[in-house]
Amino acid sequence: AGHLEQPQISSTKTLSKTARLECVVSGITISATSVYWYRERPGEVIQFLVSISYDGTVRKESGIPSGKFEVDRIPETSTSTLTIHNVEKQDIATYYCALWEV
């Protein structure tokens, strides 16, 4: 079974800068899985943001601006990254990665 680890306990960024979060996958080949990213804003329900599937297809939540989040995966390091562009106060949240094994 796959295992996920998010090595960064927290990330502090200046407004309008870029934040990059990592999710390390072990126990399974990352290119044979789909990785999903979610966020939980304080006091709000958890929300799907974006995913990258085994074939590289990227899907994002409807209504999220196309340039806001970028998802990638690096097979060499078995890592998925979530990039948050133009960081603003609304981006303050806990971000989770999840795995779907094909």
């Epitope: 599937s53 074939d55 590289g56 297809t57 990227v58 899907r59 994002k60 939540e61 409807s62 601006p65 196309s66 340039g67 970028e70």
Partner: nanobody
């Protein structure tokens, strides 16, 4: 509402080249990931190539890798498909499609929000 208009199709000899264009109007072009799909006579619609919202990521069907190149110019609201080393089996109607929320080879037909009318490419000697 987004309007997509393809152009550039035609008849070409095997080994030849064509460049398809797809001009978009009616909405913010960069809000959409773009794809090219094709339908050969008597066959289903199949994925050819796709490009992400920003243009930073491209995808290709195995059958066209190394021969076709997809690109986009967000300032011109246009996506292109450069087709080289064309083969008889590339003969099809080529469709441009736009998706708000999906980019890549796995996007299902219903995940594309808008479609062009199609342009016919015939590869024949």
């Amino acid at each position: 509402e987004v309007q997509l208009v393809e152009s550039g199709g035609g008849v070409v000899q095997p080994g030849g080249s064509l460049r398809l264009s797809c001009a978009a109007s009616g909405s913010t072009f960069s809000d959409f990931a773009m794809g090219w799909l094709r339908q050969a006579p008597g066959k289903g619609r199949e994925f050819v190539a796709a490009i992400s919202w920003t243009g930073g990521r491209t995808y290709y069907a195995d059958s066209v890798k190394g021969r076709f190149t997809i690109s986009r110019d967000n300032s011109k609201n246009t996506v292109y498909l450069q087709m080289n080393s064309l083969r008889a089996e590339d003969t099809a109607v080529y469709y441009c499609a736009a998706s708000r929320d999906c980019s890549g080879p796995g996007c299902r037909v219903h995940e594309y929000d808008y479609w062009g009318q199609g342009t016919l490419v015939t590869v024949s000697s």
